[in-house]
């Protein structure tokens, strides 16, 4: 449906405040430099053309696409070649190739400072003193940090902020009721960033049929009642709805989100049993329950999948007649009766059955050749269920902490090549699979688990596409989407690295460490582990374990002291000595 | 002059438990480590278990989950409880302090030896 001035067809859809909110996203997701003041009057400005727009469509630019709207605003940035160097290259180009310039200059890991927390009582003055302006800030500093962030439901979390503030600055205790609901929606912000960092990675890096396979499995599980024609449908719809958001066309996807809701909610007898109380809520609330919405109960009596997809003599024929649409309902019935698998596991068998028949459908006995291709899903099955079974007892031995620092070790010994913050913080987030996962029953550890690992590895991808100085990482990542895991898993020490020099300075602390939170202080210690095997590749676990111990008493023991900086310095040396002896330096 | 005196080692079964103690004297130990190394028959002496002045402790993998060293740093005593006891712990049993708090699980980081106690472990 052609509509004569595509922003007013989006700023009638979305109304006022949701457009301005969008706009105020993808213009911090694309200049992640630029000062919030800045992007305020962009929006601004922009807003008011759309008005004059929605007033009379035929009005001049008015039947400009989004893309060249939008691209013109942001090329009027005075400052553009000054801050961003090469990107000011992209408002040369006609779109839609200056869209895929701003596309390829999104940065993953932007040089911005860490967002500091207020005071309770600073942030409380700040909002009610202006909430419009406070809750804009909120969505600027989420969206220039996070450039993929899913920006629909980046609303969702700032209307949950708000409310966060509004109910909380008019409490007894502020801090009480304030600072645990920002954890949470900080905590979550992150996670969903980063889930939404692989969906698009799936996209832009392997294509659609990639995503669409994704988004196949993952809904079979989630609504195995539904027919394989509905879950095709919104399959399609979906992944309209995300090679939007990943493509910066923020507006169409809030809109198509929507849509998206509203046919959910308006079909959900044919989709799912549970989705009636996220059909009662309203908008955002509706689309984010939506998302994460349980898997419905499996229908009882469902067949043996052998018969339509191995023993029927019609295998090669269905499979030749329409390869996709045949292996997508092969993906669909296996995926609808196994909620207990991972859904990259899910799409490793579909990859081995569609190799399988690729092969067997030329032989001169197909049938004879693929008749035991079930029996070759077992090896890939239980290897990601041993993997978890050994992790989680690894996990429930060491607890958070020492588990996050064994699979430091595994993975500097792994990649040593890699920065030391980006293991750091990879690590750590891989880490968190144990917390995540491990409390879970049988069946559903393993989706929980491996759909968590990819989501983490993907961080681990982007961030090393951006300075690329691993070649093995560079494998693992392009190689296969859904094989990353099993790629990670299996490399071994790297043989080839060449230690590091030994530097003192980098095992030099001060003070400061002191006042810092236990989060932080715990990731000092595992910025000096990963340096440590940086330096001694080939140190045992047990020596790392007790050199770090030293580490752990040097902390506590100089933040004890009368004079902190003289011990760290005078312990420090001690300390240094004893480390370079115990790993041979 | 510094002198650790063992007490504690004997006979066990397989399964049982010991606790051995160290007395130190003749020096101060507040600010290093103190614990304990092991030698078998024919075998190199090998490190169990040591505390810090803070409190923090670092044990052999071999011993890790069956060991627990404690100390009273009032009383320049190290302790070192051994539960599950099995055939290979079968050693001489030497107390230790450090020269300083890190290092104390190799050799090169102890300044004081005792002379050691005799720990079987019959099957």
């Known amino acids: 449906d052609a509509h004569k001035s595509e922003v007013a067809h989006r700023f009638k859809d979305l109304g006022e405040e949701n457009f301005k909110a969008l706009v105020l996203i993808a213009f911090a997701q694309y200049l992640q430099q630029c000062p919030f003041e800045d992007h305020v009057k962009l929006v601004n400005e922009v807003t008011e053309f759309a008005k004059t727009c929605v007033a009379d469509e035929s009005a001049e630019n008015c039947d400009k696409s989004l893309h060249t709207l939008f691209g013109d605003k942001l090329c009027t940035v005075a400052t553009l070649r000054e801050t961003y160097g090469e990107m000011a290259d992209c408002c040369a180009k006609q779109e839609p190739e200056r869209n895929e310039c701003f596309l390829q200059h999104k940065d993953d890991n932007p040089n911005l400072p860490r967002l500091v927390r207020p005071e309770v009582d600073v942030m409380c003055t700040a909002f009610h003193d202006n909430e419009e302006t406070f809750l804009k800030k909120y969505l600027y500093e989420i969206a220039r940090r996070h450039p993929y962030f899913y920006a629909p439901e980046l609303l969702f979390f700032a209307k949950r902020y708000k409310a966060a503030f509004t109910e909380c600055c008019q409490a007894a205790d502020k801090a009480a009721c304030l600072l645990p609901k920002l954890d949470e929606l900080r905590d979550e912000g992150k996670a969903s960033s980063a889930k939404q960092r692989l969906k698009c990675a799936s996209l832009q890096k392997f294509g659609e049929r990639a995503f669409k396979a994704w988004a196949v499995a993952r809904l079979s599980q989630r609504f195995p009642k539904a027919e394989f024609a509905e879950v095709s449908k919104l399959v399609t719809d979906l992944t309209k709805v995300h090679t939007e958001c990943c493509h910066g066309d923020l507006l169409e996807c809030a809109d198509d989100r929507a849509d998206l809701a509203k046919y959910i909610c308006e079909n959900q007898d044919s989709i799912s049993s549970k989705l009636k109380e996220c059909c009662e809520k309203p908008l955002l609330e509706k689309s984010h329950c939506i998302a994460e919405v349980e898997n419905d109960e499996m229908p009882a009596d469902l067949p043996s999948l052998a018969a339509d997809f191995v023993e029927s003599k019609d295998v090669c024929k269905n499979y030749a007649e329409a390869k996709d649409v045949f292996l997508g309902m092969f993906l669909y019935e296996y995926a609808r009766r196994h909620p207990d698998y991972s859904v990259v596991l899910l799409l490793r068998l579909a990859k081995t059955y569609e190799t399988t028949l690729e092969k067997c459908c030329a032989a001169a006995d197909p049938h004879e050749c693929y008749a035991k291709v079930f029996d070759r899903f077992k090896p890939l099955v239980e290897e990601p269920q041993n993997l978890i079974k050994q992790n989680c007892e690894l996990f429930e031995q060491l607890g958070e902490y020492k588990f996050q620092n064994a699979l430091l070790v595994r993975y500097t010994k792994k990649v040593p090549q890699v920065s030391t913050p980006t293991l750091v913080e990879v690590s750590r987030n891989l880490g968190k699979v144990g917390s995540k996962c491990c409390k879970h029953p049988e069946a559903k550890r393993m989706p929980c688990a491996e759909d968590y690992l990819s989501v983490v590895l993907n961080q681990l991808c982007v961030l090393h596409e951006k300075t690329p100085v691993s070649d093995r990482v560079t494998k693992c990542c392009t190689e296969s989407l859904v094989n990353r895991r099993p790629c990670f898993s299996a490399l071994e020490v790297d043989e080839t690295y060449v230690p590091k020099e030994f530097n003192a300075e980098t095992f030099t602390f001060h003070a400061d460490i002191c006042t810092l939170s236990e989060k932080e202080r715990q990731i000092k210690k595992q910025t000096a582990l990963v340096e440590l095997v940086k330096h001694k590749p080939k140190a045992t676990k047990e020596q790392l374990k007790a050199v770090m111990d030293d580490f752990a008493a040097f902390v506590e023991k100089c933040c004890k002291a009368d004079d902190k900086e003289t011990c760290f310095a005078e312990e420090g040396k001690k300390l240094v000595a004893a480390s370079q002896a115990a790993l041979g330096l | 002059h510094v002198q650790l005196v063992e007490s504690g080692g004997g006979l066990a079964q397989a399964g049982g438990s010991l606790r051995l103690s160290c007395a130190a004297s003749g020096g101060t130990f507040s600010n290093s480590c103190m614990g304990w190394f092991r030698q078998a028959p024919g075998m190199e002496r090998e490190f169990v278990a040591i505390?810090?002045?803070?409190?923090?402790?670092t044990y052999a993998d071999s011993v890790e989950g069956r060991f627990t060293v404690s100390r009273d740093i009032a009383k320049n005593t190290v302790y070192l409880e051994m539960n599950s006891l099995k055939p290979e712990d079968t050693a001489v049993y030497s107390c230790v302090a450090g020269v300083s708090d890190y290092g104390c699980y190799r050799t090169s980081g102890i300044k004081y030896w005792g002379q050691g106690t005799q720990v079987t472990v019959s099957s």
């Open positions: 505390i810090r002045s803070t409190g923090h402790t």
